[in-house]
Interface confidence: low
Amino acid sequence: YDFTNCDFEKIKAAYLSTISKDLITYMSGTKSTEFNNTVSCSNRPHCLTEIQSLTFNPTAGCASLAKEMFAMKTKAALAIWCPGYSETQINATQAMKKRRKRKVTTNKCLEQVSQLQGLWRRFNRPLLKQQ
């Protein structure tokens, strides 16, 4: 999916109001310095591409992020503010309906969510911070 035509400010607002807090809740009890950020992005569409990949694509050692609250809200924000995004995600939605109960959070998942926090920070990075 090409994220170029998303309403970035609306997505930013969704992140600031809820998604960021859910990410912090997920990472609670983890030191902010525990993981080094190895994933980055160069502009807002690129950031959303990386965020989608890390949030919804299962990886070795961390298959369950798509079931987390922050992931649900991320999916909703993208569906609402990125034209045509929902249509590309039908298969992913069907797969999520079959979800099991959440497993124990693995260190790999914590590391992945730490990377997500960094990507979201990059996405929201203002030219001039808002008061």
Partner: antibody, heavy 122, light 108 residues
Amino acid sequence: QMQLVESGGGVVQPGRSLRLSCAASGFAFRTYGMHWVRQAPGKGLEWVAVIWYDGSATHYADSVKGRFTITRDNSKNTLNLQMNSLRAEDTAVYYCVRAPQWYLSAEAFDLWGQGTMVTVSS
Amino acid sequence: SYVLTQPPSVSVAPGETATITCGGNLIGAYLVHWYQQKPGQAPVLVIYDDVDRPARIPERFSGSNSGNTATLTISRVEAGDEADYYCQVWDHDTNTMVFGGGTKLTVL
């Protein structure tokens, strides 16, 4: 190994010109904004100029505007600073500096050269 | 253009906490970066975007920024931390990078 190496410094008389160069290696030079920063002997850091990653924009400190010109050659991984109408107050160590670029804002300087000394004296 | 004000010097005993401030009009609205410079060496980035720490910078270094003051805090200060420290912001109004005057940290 990521590296920035400055050259071209030296002693020059007031009113004359000097051209500094900076050779970059070990990273994707064309994707970074590049700056010159200077430091007069015993003084603090002073930002001089920036050129965007693609050369599309340049900005200068008021103290050098109209006298200094920053350019880059992405095919050769080089940064240049053409300094004209030099003054005694331009005497300083000149650092070539790399900064990731985010939209149109300049970011923190994450890689510095070791600097080249420019002395303007009669 | 935008002005950043730092105290010329700060002294602290080994093992104590050093606090270096950087004042500017509504500096909390800007992203602040901090550099360490030891004699005869090029500066090194120690804190960027107010609070983030580059790899290889000890956890003892931290930053904060709100209102009219940004702060660099060095906990459990060591002799090797003795250096000049500079704050920096990008001034979007004038498209210029601005440095503070620098603070000399002395470890007693």
